[in-house]
């Protein structure tokens, strides 16, 4: 059967500082050396790319310098941080892995994990 | 809105080169993975090759293994089909598309190029 | 290799009537990853439905897309003038990306 399943979790509530965290982790039906890795953000239809990393199996993933996701690998699972989220960012983050090498390439794709982000109440002033 | 724009198509002789061009425009091209999907006349259609993201992963269908090159330059949006060795079973109007977020399924087209090898 | 068969060929209908389209894979494949198109002719291929079962923006809700594993089927719940035309499954969950070879769908 050729298929790579993705699991992610279904809910994930953002701190109180706007990070988020889950692991993504995948079935190989083959010995990938090459892995990409995307988290998709789905709200109202819409689809955006948040960020895209790809890995050599055995390093350690990189994400561009200005992306809002760190990660780091091992094995078959990734995790994933996302940060400087608000509550508008708030919906269905969906992680898509992709074995890019060597042939053939093999996709899959996770249910998605909703993130929940509460914007933390301002601090009210105190009069000492 | 996403447009894909080819050219580079005509009459070549069995043996020759002809190299096709894809112009994309509307969305960032460098984020998709990128197709040539082709159809004989009164034929169905046959997936060709795709590249992906920054260029350096690229698959193909077996017929065309050794003979055609697919590459991208990202800094203009534009794709390119490099064609060797040009047989007569390559004759086809060739599509550009676009793959998609969710997989390489293709929710954008370009109108297509008629490639026609004969002697 | 996945390949893909489509059934039936032809399939030979009246306006207002359904229609049922089946696409078989040689191997069960990653969840799902199967699409749809409609083709006229001289014009590119228009998708319909990708995830099996998704309908792309702007398709009508008389396709519906639906199986899994190796089965695979397209409905068209009563057709219109304008959709009759041929239609294409793909598979894209590992490569060779691969189509199936169609099915057309003409006026009786």
């Known amino acids: 059967c050729k298929a790579m399943h993705v699991a992610q979790p279904a809910v994930v509530l953002a701190s109180s500082r706007g990070i988020a965290s889950f692991v993504c982790e995948y079935a190989s039906p083959g010995k990938a050396t090459e892995v990409r890795v995307t988290v998709l953000r789905q709200a109202d239809s819409q689809v955006t790319e948040v960020c895209a990393a790809t890995y050599m199996m055995g390093n350690e993933l990189t994400f561009l310098d200005d992306s809002i996701c760190t990660g780091t690998s091992s094995g078959n699972q990734v995790n994933l941080t996302i940060q400087g989220l608000r509550a508008m960012d708030t919906g269905l983050y969906i992680c898509k892995v992709e074995l890019m090498y060597p042939p053939p390439y093999y996709l899959g794709i996770g249910n998605g994990t909703q993130i929940y982000v509460i914007d933390p109440e301002p601090c009210p002033d105190s009069d000492f | 809105q996403v447009q894909l724009v080819e050219s580079g198509g005509g009459v070549v002789q069995p043996g020759r080169s002809l190299r096709l061009s894809c112009a994309a425009s509307?969305?960032?091209?460098?984020?998709?993975?990128m197709h040539w999907v082709r159809q004989a006349p009164g034929k169905g259609l046959e997936w060709v090759a795709v590249i992906w993201y920054d260029g350096r992963n690229k698959y193909y269908v077996d017929s065309v293994k050794g003979r055609f090159t697919i590459s991208r330059d990202n800094s203009n949006n534009t794709l390119y089909l490099q064609m060797n060795s040009l047989r007569a079973e390559d004759t086809a109007v060739y599509y550009c598309a676009r793959g998609e977020f969710f997989g390489e399924f293709f929710d954008y087209w370009g109108q297509g190029t008629l490639v026609t090898v004969s002697s | 290799e996945i390949v893909l068969t489509q059934s039936p060929g032809t399939l030979s209908l009246s306006p207002g009537e359904g229609a049922t389209l089946s696409c078989r894979a040689s191997q069960s494949f990653s969840s799902n990853y199967l699409a749809w198109y409609q083709q006229k002719p001289g014009q590119a291929p228009r998708l319909l439905i990708y995830g099996a079962s998704s309908r792309a923006t702007g398709i009508p809700d008389r396709f519906s897309g639906s199986g899994s594993g190796t089965d695979f089927t397209l409905t068209i719940s009563r057709l219109e003038p304008e959709d009759f035309a041929v239609y294409y499954c793909?598979?894209?969950?590992?490569?060779?990306?691969?189509f199936g070879p169609g099915t057309k769908v003409d006026i009786k």
């Open positions: 509307g969305f960032t091209f460098s984020s998709f993975g």
């Open positions: 793909q598979q894209y969950g590992t490569s060779p990306f691969t």
